[in-house]
């Protein structure tokens, strides 16, 4: 019984030895050779790898997959047959041979058999568990491919389509652009032509230009001429106003000690009894310090004090922020009177504000405010106005609220850009606003579309360039 | 932002009307003049008719003098322009555009225009 033993022998068959007394049983069973060696044992329950097999590859495993099943097939029905045989002879010789006790080693034997059947059905099993495991496998990697295909024909589906439409709206782009060039060319020719015609003028206009520049040198010299004579009436009337003064201080001293009053406006010169329009000394408020301002004491009941006009483009109102400050020009033609005495006055008492205006087609209009100041220097002279009444428009020309005075060398305006530079003159510009008394003076038939003219929105728009204007202050209470 | 969208234009026969409108927005309405100008087929563009903020004064081409009417209704943000014994030749793209403060009576702001079509 227990002299079983197992070896192999020179052709690699398993050689089955059992000795029992004087007799000795040798059974050879064939080895495959696909079959795993008992060297290297087969884990049934080894973990599959996880990253998918090349599909190639795993077509090609499942093939040798499929021989080893044939293979261990035959190989079964090799070893059923070869049983079968072994166990007749065997049958036979006990019957012939064997004594009764002989029928336990063969129950042993035929029992150890059955073991290595079962042994090698077990592993048949494993190794089909393994190919439908495989094949499960491969099956649901092809089902991915297939899904993946689909999905892919469905995306090369829909950018053909998308395609498509890009070519459908490219061709509609190309007859709008192609149509706009036709257009564009129309618009060239039209323009080319509008140039030649403007070239046509431009040249008209230089040597009209020549010829003024000619008559303006001519008028310079007549008024340097002019300037002098009248710096020497001045000067003659002021003898005659002083020889004047003098005889009659000698026979009335009551009038002497009249003429010796100062005037902070031109109502006070009105209410002292000088009721005629002209050019007026007048006292800074609490100061000795004085200025020469122009008079209307007959407009709208008079003792009105002109803080500006314009009337003929003789002055040049692109002036610096000092020139603005201190006044500049002539009381008797454009002159700017000055910010700081206007400042300081209309800080003094309530003052309103009348700005007449005329345009080059005879009409005349006006805008009145009946509370004005001006803010100090270190304010800007910020301009302040109230309550609108007049025929100049509806709407304030002069922005609202006010806003800081600007020149060419002061910008305080609410643009990027220097109105004043831009517009030119000083004015209390926004951005650029609806205004500019201080403008460019334009002659008449010259005087339409010039965006830095004698400007005034609400009467005559943004473009038109006016005659005369006339800006004049008094005291609300007058 | 300022826009000005202009309606009221369409086919109408020789001797006929029409009344254009311009509604506008993002800007005060009141506070700028206004004008309508217009562009035949193939032609350049021609000035109509102003009128100033107010409505009080308004100003008219030579060629449709008499017959055109510019007005403006503040309170509803809107120019017309009402168009009586329309002839062939006032056929055209009209616009109403925006006079700005310092445009030098050029326009700042246009519409996209509609077109009236006088034909029989």
């Known amino acids: 019984y227990n002299n079983f033993r197992k070896s192999m022998d020179s052709i690699g068959k398993k050689q089955y030895q059992v000795q029992h007394g004087s007799c000795s049983y040798t059974f050879l069973l064939p080895e495959m050779d696909n079959c795993r060696s008992s060297s290297s044992p087969y884990v049934s329950n080894a973990v599959q790898r996880d990253a998918p097999l090349e599909y190639d590859d795993s077509v090609q495993r499942l093939q040798v997959l499929e021989n080893i099943m044939e293979n261990n097939t035959q190989w079964l029905m090799k070893l059923e047959n070869y049983i079968q045989d072994n166990m007749k002879k065997e049958m036979v010789e006990i019957q012939q041979n064997a004594v009764q006790n002989q029928t336990a080693v063969m129950i042993e034997i035929g029992t150890n058999l059955l073991n290595q059947t079962a042994e090698q059905t077990r592993k048949l099993t494993d190794v089909e568990a393994q190919v439908l495991n495989q094949t499960t496998r491969l099956e649901l990697q092809l089902l991915e491919h297939s899904l993946s295909t689909n999905k892919l024909e469905k995306q090369i589906l829909d950018q053909t389509s998308e395609i498509n439409k890009l070519q459908d709206k490219n061709s509609f782009l190309e007859k709008k652009v192609l149509a706009m060039e036709d257009k564009h060319i129309i618009q060239l020719q039209s323009i080319k032509e509008e140039k030649d015609q403007l070239q046509v003028l431009v040249s008209k206009q230089n040597s009209i230009i020549e010829e003024l520049e000619k008559k303006i040198v001519t008028a310079t010299v007549n008024n340097s001429v002019l300037q002098k004579q009248q710096h020497d009436l001045m000067e003659t009337v002021n003898n005659l106003l002083t020889m004047m003064s003098t005889s009659n201080s000698a026979k009335d001293p009551t009038v002497a000690k009249e003429e010796q009053i100062s005037f902070r406006d031109c109502a006070e010169v009105f209410k002292s009894g000088h009721t005629t329009n002209g050019i007026y000394t007048l006292t800074f408020p609490n100061s000795t310090e004085e200025i020469k301002a122009y008079c209307d004491m007959e407009a709208g009941g008079g003792g009105w004090t002109i803080i500006q006009r314009r009337e003929d483009g003789s002055v040049d109102f692109q002036r610096t922020w000092k020139e603005y400050k201190v006044g500049f020009g002539n009381p008797s033609g454009e002159y700017w009177l000055g910010n700081e005495f206007v400042s300081q006055l209309t800080n003094q008492q309530r003052y309103v504000l009348k700005i007449h205006l005329k345009d080059w087609e005879g009409n005349e209009a006006y805008s009145l405010y009946e509370h004005f100041y001006l803010s100090s220097e270190e304010l800007n002279y910020r301009i302040h106005l109230k309550g609108l009444t007049g025929t100049a428009g509806k709407i304030s020309s002069i922005s609202q609220p006010g806003n800081d005075f600007s020149t060419k060398d002061g910008d305080n305006d609410k643009c990027i850009c220097k109105c004043s530079q831009m517009l030119t003159g000083g004015w209390w510009f926004d951005a650029c606003g609806p205004s500019n008394l201080n403008g460019m003076y334009y002659p008449q038939r010259q005087n339409t579309n010039k965006f830095n003219g004698i400007k005034w929105y609400y009467w005559k728009g943004s473009g038109y360039s006016l005659k005369a204007t006339t800006m004049m202050i008094r005291p609300a209470d007058f | 932002q300022v826009q000005l969208v202009e309606s009221g234009g369409g086919l109408v026969q020789p001797g006929g009307s029409l009344r254009l409108s311009c509604a506008a927005s993002?800007?005060?309405?009141?506070?700028?003049?206004m004008h309508w100008v217009r562009q035949a087929p193939g032609k350049g563009l021609v000035w109509v008719s102003r009128?100033?903020?107010?409505?009080?004064?308004?100003s008219y081409a030579d060629s449709v003098k008499g017959r055109f009417t510019i007005s403006r209704d503040n309170a509803k943000n809107t120019l017309y322009l009402q168009m009586n014994s329309l002839r062939a030749e006032d056929t055209a793209v009209y616009y109403c555009?925006?006079?700005?403060?310092?445009?030098?009576?050029?326009?700042?702001?246009w519409g996209q225009g509609t077109l009236v079509t006088v034909s029989s």
């Open positions: 555009a925006r006079e700005g403060y310092s445009s030098g009576g050029q326009f700042d702001y």
């Open positions: 009128i100033n903020s107010d409505g009080s004064s308004t």
């Open positions: 993002g800007y005060t309405f009141a506070a700028y003049w």
